[in-house]
Interface confidence: low
């Protein structure tokens, strides 16, 4: 039988009446056009909805937009377009919502051709009021908030000027010209690249990387011959042109660009690219594109300094620069990532790692599934997950994989069961243990979302026909109930729930069409009465993450420690609540070779946990460039994996000696660095 139809599925009592009393419809007085939605703050219930409609006239396009505000999680909306003087808002800039719970919002307005600068509307009270401000420049990018201080904004102008505001957009100052890319770093630092000659495009590979730590009073050039730069975790990366040819290499800094080291990664040519797939304060996943138009490359994982890299996964699917990759961080379980590889026969297969890129394996076949036509052996196959690449290829996949940090262990994704990803219509699968085991959850493609930290999963069938039914599960997708939320079906466009999966409200967005008109409509359903009581201690059970063999003493050890969680029992129908905090008990494991990556000059042969010396470096002194000094490395080949907390056990020797010699690694040496003040 299909999932959720087994007799043992307990019914949620009287749910139709409970949900009917908590279903709120709002019809927007708009022609259809486009709609964008933003949540303002965390747990505030404030939603802003911007609808825009373009009327193509003979000479120009005339646009109109409307702004709506809800303060009850979308149950009711108020038209507040008059607060922005009925101005047309540019949707390509979106709604710039301030960090944390600052309550700040910036909307960028469309202005007439001859104006001196752009116009913004600013709110610092969760969009209750807006102030109109005329800009001394035309913005090229959305306003970017400093993560540390929401009063500090930066923007690039259409003239490539870098503009900064220190008073939440009231007053603006151009701090630098000829800027290509600018990003906030930590401590209100701004990093940006500049061109000297023609333009960003013409000077690519000859750009300079600058830093200001005082919002433009003084500057320091921290890099030359720059192609691009990126920030990830505590790492600053720059791809730098080599002296002699057109190749470039990654350099990394962990001190905001004061000192740089060359990353032990392959150099890339003109047609290739580097991409930071994921980064945290411990390490980085770096994709290095293969030469030629292969559509794949190699994933490398870094050490704690971002300098020494281990090959993690070959033939990693990643189409051209800025293209598609299926790389997904499973946020519901530490150390888990899913991605796709392009095999020799050009089929695409899903791989999963449970130890932050140390080892990759296929996903285990779901027990309640048959192998499809792609499988050579009908009894042996794997689950393959549809992600960004499938969506880009217009397969019938409405959503990427979903996981939430506070819904421990839960991963929901579209997939197919065989030897490779199938172009057939996918089903929806769920894992409740972070990707180790999977179960078919729903037949056919669906939209899905997680509410109440995993206490409720909501899904809507993906269909070209109008819909009026929502499905929900209170037991992590084992059993499903269906609820008809409206008599008149709507053309469904999206599910919206507050980021963080703590809410119990879901908004279903769509439009209605009648003979003469088309209107936006939303239905917000509050599940609070389905989960009638607050969860108690008895509703939770202990779960050991990453447990694969309860008989093994080291069961659950990943990156040197294991974690035991309190998780909601599937049979408990209760509210985790908005204040729910994941309860976990970590414990340290003894070190084994698995807790170490291979050091500079060493590699791991396949299916071996020992690191052996690279043949080309055998007998050579291991000397490498670090922070602009030459270092001598004494090692037996191992370096602790970033973030690994193991103690005791195996303890390989490692020592780095400063050779007191300068080296520049094709990059800036300190004497080349210059500072200047405005």
């Amino acid at each position: 039988s299909a999932p959720g139809e087994d007799e043992e599925c307990g019914r949620v009592r009287d749910f139709v009446a409970k949900l009917a009393n908590n279903t709120h419809q709002h019809v927007f007085d708009d022609l259809r056009g486009s709609v964008s939605l933003s949540w303002v703050g965390d747990s505030t219930g404030v939603i802003l909805v911007l609808t825009t409609f373009h009327v193509p006239l003979v000479i120009m396009t005339f646009g109109q937009s409307k702004l709506y505000r809800s303060e009850d999680y979308g149950k009711n909306f108020k038209d507040i377009t008059d607060l922005i003087n009925n101005t047309f808002i540019r949707t390509e800039f979106g709604m710039a919502i301030g960090p944390e719970n600052s309550g700040k919002v910036v909307l960028t307005a469309e202005v007439s051709g001859g104006s001196r600068g752009g116009r913004i509307f600013r709110s610092s009270d969760f969009a209750k009021n807006f102030v109109q401000t005329d800009l001394p420049f035309h913005p090229l990018t959305q306003m970017m908030y400093s993560p540390q201080n929401s009063d500090y904004l930066l923007a690039l102008s259409t003239e490539n000027g870098l503009w900064v505001s220190k008073n939440f957009g009231g007053k603006w100052e151009e701090i630098h010209k000829a800027v290509c890319l600018a990003k906030w770093g930590s401590d209100n630092t701004i990093f940006f690249t500049t061109y000297a000659n023609g333009s960003c495009k013409a000077d690519l590979g000859a750009l300079e990387l600058w830093r200001t730590s005082d919002l433009g009073k003084s500057f320091k050039t921290i890099g030359v011959k720059i192609y691009s730069f990126g920030l990830g975790g505590r790492f600053l990366f720059a791809s730098v042109m080599a002296d002699k040819d057109t190749t470039r290499r990654i350099h990394v800094s962990t001190d905001q660009g004061d000192t740089w080291s060359m990353a032990q990664l392959p150099s890339v040519g003109q047609e290739q690219f580097y991409s930071i797939l994921a980064a945290n304060d411990d390490m980085v996943f770096m994709h290095v594109d293969e030469p030629g138009d292969t559509g794949f490359g190699t994933i490398f994982t870094s050490d704690d300094r971002g300098i020494v890299y281990s090959k993690s996964l070959d033939r990693h699917l990643y189409t051209t620069t800025g293209g598609e990759t299926d790389f997904t961080n499973v946020t519901s379980l530490r150390g888990v990532y899913i991605t796709s590889v392009l095999s020799e026969d050009n089929s695409i297969q899903t791989m999963i790692t449970f130890d932050q890129g140390g080892r990759w394996t296929h996903l285990r076949k779901p027990e309640n599934s048959e192998c499809d036509a792609t499988a050579k052996n009908k009894n042996e196959c794997s689950l393959h997950i549809h992600a960004s690449y499938s969506i880009s290829q217009k397969l019938n996949v409405p959503m990427a994989p979903l996981s939430e940090p506070n819904a421990v262990g839960i991963v929901i994704a579209h997939g197919s069961v065989g030897d490779a990803i199938s172009v057939m219509v996918p089903d929806v699968y769920i894992s409740d243990d972070g990707g180790y085991s999977w179960t078919k959850m729903l037949e056919g493609p669906h939209y899905y979302t997680i509410l109440d930290s995993g206490g409720i999963i909501v899904a809507i069938e993906h269909s070209s026909r109008p819909i009026n039914v929502i499905k929900f599960s209170t037991d992590e997708g084992q059993c499903w109930q269906t609820y008809t939320f409206t008599r008149d079906p709507i053309y469904f466009t999206g599910l919206a729930s507050e980021p963080g999966a703590r809410s119990m409200n879901i908004s279903i967005w769509g439009f209605t069409e009648s003979f003469l008109t088309s209107q936006w409509v939303s239905y917000t359903i509050d599940f609070k009465d389905i989960l009638e009581r607050n969860c108690e201690e008895k509703d939770y059970t202990i779960w050991l993450a990453h447990s694969t063999d309860p008989e093994d003493y080291e069961d659950g050890c990943i990156l040197g420690y294991k974690e035991q969680f309190l998780r909601l029992r599937k049979s408990s129908v209760c509210q985790n609540g908005r204040d729910y905090v994941v309860t976990k008990q970590p414990s340290i494991c003894l070190c084994s070779l698995e807790d170490f990556l291979c050091d500079f000059g060493y590699y791991r042969p396949e299916n071996d946990s020992k690191c052996v010396e690279q043949p080309e470096l055998k007998g050579h002194d291991l000397e490498f460039c670090l922070y602009g000094r030459e270092e001598h490395l004494t090692t037996n080949g191992y370096r602790k994996i970033p973030g690994d907390k193991c103690q005791g056990g195996v303890n390989p020797v490692r020592e780095v000696k400063d050779l007191k010699k300068k080296c520049t690694s094709n990059f800036l040496s300190p004497e080349k660095q210059n500072s200047k003040s405005n």
Partner: antibody, heavy 124, light 107 residues
Amino acid sequence: QVQLVQSGAEVKKPGASVKVSCKASGYTFTSYMMHWVRQAPGQGLEWMGIIGPSGGYTSYAQKFQGRVTMTRDTSISTAYMELSRLRSDDTAVYYCARGKRSSGWYEGYGMDVWGQGTTVTVSS
Amino acid sequence: DIQMTQSPSSLSASVGDRVTITCRASQSISSYLNWYQQKPGKAPKLLIYAASSLQSGVPSRFSGSGSGTDFTLTISSLQPEDFATYYCQQSDVSPITFGGGTKVEIK
């Protein structure tokens, strides 16, 4: 019931080696670590090292590094500790002790089941 | 290596007394501390693991507390069979180390 039975007392000359065995019964031998601890006459307890469930993993206290070898034979559920180059101050009672685990959860490597001890006397 | 210091090294008490033994680690060991009881000529017996969890089969008059560097074993009402030597042991960092022991004697 769960128990660890150790081999009998040994008298050795300085410079010789001793191999103490520890036979487990009443539980899945391959699911637990085994510690070795010794106690000199009138003294406290001294940890010597640990061997993993499958025997592939060992960790020894620095003091015994190079002199101690811990092994296990899973086919007969027996762990062994061999100490070489014996000295008179190696005279002690040697214990094997099972590493505690509880419902698949690490409990900080307490030792919940102990052997009866093997007295090793080193004397010329 | 982490040093484990037990105090007192010996104490005299009567049946029914409340007895407290302390153990101090030379650096933080979180809650990775275990307590053992040893009687003459016998192997040690695990009483408390992870600082405060009572090992099954151990009478509830034994309790443990503490985390970081300071830990306590308490016997709420001393019984005749409790006269023995008690050891603390850390398992946070290799090598595992034991305290010097506390001998509980009859007054």
